[in-house]
C-alpha cells in the first residue's frame, strides 16, 4: 500500500532510499522543454517476486516544441530559477542494495529526464538519513525511518537523528564524505510524495572523485 | 492531505459556455498531471484530457478538442475547463482528477437548458 | 482508442461472499490499469494502481489481478459498504479509458 505523508523532516538533514519495494511508483517526469510522449507511461513501477525485482514500464521524454502554452500557466519563482546541476547523471548503487530481496535499485536516468524524482513510497519502506554538509550527528542512534501500517493508517517512524552545526558530516551507510552540500533546506507540506535530486559532484582536484548527494524536497 | 475542491454546479443556456474550477492542495500542483472525466447516466466515464500545470502542457481526447480548453494558474494551484457552444449533449457531472497516484475532485453538475 | 469492456453491468451477491469483477482491454496495455469503486452520490474513489497494487487504505479483501489485456477485481468476504459501481481504466497509452462500469447488488 501506498504511504499516505512524507518521511518526517529533520532539520538540517536529508534522506535516501538505499533500495525501493515493491509497489513504489516513481513519476515519469521530463526536463524543461520536454514533456512524457502521449503513447508513454505515466510512471514507473518496482515489480517482481522474492528473488527478482525489477522497474516496469519506461518513461520516455520528447521535445515539447509544438507546446500548448496559455497566458495562466506561469512557472512558480523557484521554478524559474536554474539549476546548478542540470544533468541527472548515473545514480549511485549501494554494494547491499542487489542483496535485498522484493527491492528494485534506484532506477537508470532517461533520456532528458527531470533532475528532480518523484516517489511514492509504499508500506515497509525504509529511508535512511544524514546531516546535511556543515552539520553533525549530535549522538549515534537510528538514523532512518520505516513506513508502517498502524490501525489502517501508514506512518512514518521517527528517525533518532538531531543534526549540530558543527562542520562535519554525517554518512549514509558506506558512502564517502559529500564534497558539496544542497542549497537550502526543504519545506513540508502534507501529501505523498517524495522528491529526490541526484546531484554527482565532481570536486577540482586532482583526484576527481565522483559522490551522489540526495537531496530531498517535502511536496 | 491532498484534496481537489472544484466549482459549484452550473445551470447554462445552449450555446453559451462555462468556465469550471479544480482548486488542489496537498500537494506540488506543478508536478503532476491532473486530468478531467465527464459522467453521464449511461454513458460511463469519459477522460476529456490532462493538463501538466509546470509547464502548461496539454493531452486532449479528439472527442473533446474544440469543445473543451484545459488551462491552470499555478499562482492559486487551480486547474480550469472552459467548454464551449454547449448544448443538452454536454449534460453531466464533470470530475478533476490527479492523473497518478490518482485522486478525485467530488464533481461539478452542469446542465444545460433554454 | 482502447475499448475496456465490462461484460457484466450488474453483479448481485451476499454480504461474505466472494465475487469477481472482470475487465477485457481491447489490445494489450501491460499492467497499466486501475480499478475505481462509486458510490451513488460520490466521486470515484481508487482501489488498485498497475493491476494489482492496492492503495493506502483499501482494505485486503479488494484485489486486484491481470496483466495483457484481461484483469479482475476480486472482493473476498464482500460487505454491505461495498455497494456500488466498479470501473477499470487503462492508462497505457492516450486517450486514457474506462470500462462501462459494473453495479454490485448486495442481496
Known amino acids: 500500500e501506498l504511504c499516505d505523508d512524507d518521511p518526517p523532516e529533520i532539520p538540517h538533514a536529508t534522506f535516501k532510499a538505499m533500495a525501493y519495494k515493491e509497489g513504489t511508483m516513481l513519476n515519469c517526469e521530463c526536463k524543461r522543454g520536454f514533456r512524457r510522449i502521449k503513447s508513454g507511461s505515466l510512471y514507473m513501477l518496482c515489480t517482481g517476486n522474492s528473488s527478482h525485482s525489477s522497474w516496469d514500464n519506461q518513461c520516455q521524454c520528447t521535445s515539447s516544441a509544438t507546446r500548448n502554452t496559455t497566458k495562466q500557466v506561469t512557472p512558480q519563482p523557484e521554478e524559474q530559477k536554474e539549476r546548478k546541476t542540470t544533468e541527472m547523471q548515473s545514480p549511485m548503487q549501494p554494494v547491499d542494495q542487489a542483496s535485498l530481496p522484493g527491492h528494485c535499485r534506484e532506477p537508470p536516468p532517461w533520456e532528458n529526464e527531470a533532475t528532480e524524482r518523484i516517489y511514492h513510497f509504499v508500506v515497509g519502506q525504509m529511508v535512511y538519513y544524514q546531516c546535511v554538509q556543515g552539520y553533525r550527528a549530535l549522538h549515534r542512534g537510528p538514523a532512518e525511518s520505516v513506513c508502517k501500517m498502524t490501525h489502517g493508517k501508514t506512518r512514518w517512524t521517527q528517525p533518532q537523528l538531531i543534526c549540530t552545526g558543527e562542520m562535519e558530516t554525517s554518512q549514509f551507510p558506506g558512502e564517502e564524505k559529500p564534497q558539496a552540500s544542497p542549497e537550502g533546506r526543504p519545506e513540508s507540506e502534507t501529501s505523498c510524495l517524495v522528491t529526490t535530486t541526484d546531484f554527482q559532484i565532481q570536486t577540482e582536484m586532482a583526484a576527481t572523485m565522483e559522490t551522489s548527494i540526495f537531496t530531498t524536497e517535502y511536496q | 492531505q491532498i484534496q481537489l475542491q472544484q466549482s459549484g454546479a452550473e445551470l447554462v443556456r445552449p450555446g453559451t459556455s462555462v468556465k469550471i474550477s479544480c482548486k488542489a492542495s496537498g500537494y506540488t500542483f506543478t508536478n503532476y498531471w491532473l486530468g478531467w472525466v465527464k459522467q453521464r447516466p449511461g454513458h460511463g466515464l469519459e477522460w476529456i484530457g490532462d493538463?501538466?500545470?509546470?509547464?502548461?502542457?496539454?493531452n486532449y481526447n479528439e472527442k473533446f478538442k474544440g469543445k473543451a480548453t484545459l488551462t491552470a494558474d499555478t499562482s492559486s494551484s487551480t486547474a480550469y475547463m472552459q467548454l464551449s457552444s454547449l448544448t443538452s449533449e454536454d449534460s453531466a457531472v464533470y470530475f478533476c482528477?490527479?492523473?497518478?497516484?490518482?485522486?478525485w475532485g467530488q464533481g461539478t453538475t452542469l446542465t444545460v437548458s433554454a | 482508442d482502447i475499448l475496456l469492456t465490462q461484460s457484466q453491468k450488474f453483479m448481485s451477491t451476499s454480504v461474505g461472499d466472494r465475487v469477481s469483477v472482470t475487465c477485457k482491454a481491447s489490445q494489450n496495455v501491460g499492467t497499466n490499469v486501475a480499478w475505481y469503486q462509486q458510490k451513488p452520490g460520490q466521486s470515484p474513489k481508487a482501489l488498485i494502481y498497475s493491476a494489482s497494487y492496492r492503495y493506502s487504505g483499501v482494505p485486503d479483501r479488494f484485489t486486484g489481478s491481470g496483466s495483457g489485456t484481461d484483469f479482475t477485481l476480486t472482493i473476498s468476504n464482500v460487505q454491505s459498504e461495498d455497494l456500488a459501481e466498479y470501473f477499470c481504466q487503462q492508462y497505457n497509452s492516450y486517450p486514457l479509458t474506462f470500462g462501462g462500469g459494473t453495479k454490485l447488488e448486495i442481496k
Open positions: 493538463i501538466y500545470p509546470g509547464g502548461g502542457y496539454t
Open positions: 482528477a490527479r492523473v497518478t497516484p490518482a485522486s
